[in-house]
């Protein structure tokens, strides 16, 4: 039978959108007993980390200093136990922000609407970009894209209280290099009386799931247990 190790999970600590010149931190969560973790960028080896002691830690953090457009792109990680390597993690898109200019975000008919009304966001940026992105704070994985020379529109259709929250937009110079964020626009949706006061507020940036859930084993676990779970040929 085939020897396999669980595929690692790659995450960005706090957010995958990193302002230029700031430090990005990526976490690779593998297994206790893993000897070495490798971070790959666009398919090539980028960094290596070794947890110390390996049998007590289930992952590592990779710090990427001085974020810029050359470091923005697709990252993945792998790890090994003994000389056996895991499969590659899923890909993580790391974006550099605060490039060049700041767009302006507006909403029509206005920031205060009634449930069922049609709402459209407009993102405007005068410098050369053709792609615009709209993000709801706390939901930054759900990026809406739209295209336009100077301005893009984001029709939301009939809104509900679920659309309430703060929105920002970005101009994108390529998939991984974004402008400064616009000033936030807070959309207030009234109606659906039973939900109005009880609807949970969205978490603000950073995203609640963009955290590194690495743990250090403190109990008396069998030393290097993982060596044995993959021992067959």
């Amino acid at each position: 039978p085939k020897q396999t190790l669980p595929k690692p999970i790659i995450r960005a600590e706090s957010t995958y959108m990193v302002p230029k010149e700031k430090q990005a931190t990526l976490c690779c969560q593998g297994s206790y007993g893993a000897v070495e973790y490798q971070l790959h960028f666009e398919g090539s080896l980028f960094a290596v980390e070794r947890p110390k002691p390996p049998e007590r830690i289930n992952g590592v953090k990779f710090h990427i200093p001085d974020m810029n457009s050359r470091k923005a792109g697709r990252y993945s990680c792998i790890y090994r136990v003994g000389e056996l390597w895991s499969e590659r993690s899923d890909l993580l898109d790391l974006v550099v922000t605060e490039m060049y200019d700041t767009p302006t975000l507006s909403v029509h008919p206005g920031p205060e609407v009634t449930s069922g009304e049609k709402v459209t966001f407009y993102c405007r940026l005068d410098t050369a970009t053709s792609m615009f992105l709209l993000l709801k704070e706390g939901r930054s994985r759900d990026v809406q894209r739209s295209y336009g020379k100077v301005q893009a529109e984001f029709p939301m259709g009939p809104v509900t209280t679920a659309h309430r929250g703060s929105y920002r937009c970005f101009g994108s110079y390529n998939n991984y290099a974004w402008s400064f964020p616009s000033e936030p626009v807070k959309l207030l949706v009234t109606g659906d009386i039973e939900n109005t006061s009880l609807a949970p507020t969205d978490p603000t940036f950073p995203d609640s799931w963009d955290t590194c859930l690495l743990t250090r084993e403190t109990g008396l676990q069998k030393d290097l247990a993982l060596w044995d779970h993959t021992a067959q040929n």
Partner: antibody, heavy 117, light 107 residues
Amino acid sequence: QVQLVQSGAEVKKPGASVKVSCKASGYTFTSFTMHWVRQAPGQGLEWIGYINPSSGYTEYNQKFKDRTTITADKSTSTAYMELSSLRSEDTAVYYCVRGSSRGFDYWGQGTLVTVSS
Amino acid sequence: DIQMTQSPSSLSASVGDRVTITCRASENIYSNLAWFQQKPGKAPKLLVYAATNLADGVPSRFSGSGSGTDYTLTISSLQPEDFATYYCQHFWGTPRTFGGGTKVEIK
């Protein structure tokens, strides 16, 4: 059962290249790394590098990096180690070794490469 | 690079003797150490992995111990087939390196 069968002995002149093959059987070739280790006559063991046949990713001992190429052919479950610009001190037995969660668990029978003018 | 210093380089012993071979790493290798046995004209054979775990089919008279930088291979009662050369090897980083070897000879 797991078997690593290497190509036969080679005699080469200084400056030439040699390519040693290692055919794997008895396991899933792409699930394990393949390492290369050499041993000069009467000497100890020296790690050259490895390949992950699944991805083609290679890592080398810095000492050999400029002269060594490790490749793998998934269709034939065969790994190769090519060493160029041969010198007399490259005379050694070259082993392919399977890398598993337990380390270097299966070794080929070895290939003697003699470099002599 | 991590250096692996093995001692002694050779030893003479009799059948039934207890034999101890040591290996010191130049830095902490966190138990990422293996021991191999090699007989003349043959490929090395894995004896111990992860410092303390016996490989399949290895007699229980062999044992590995140690942590950090210092590791030991012990043969509790030497048998005729144990006369060979023994190597330690780390796999904590790149390059993987081996100790210089210990030749166990018949007294």
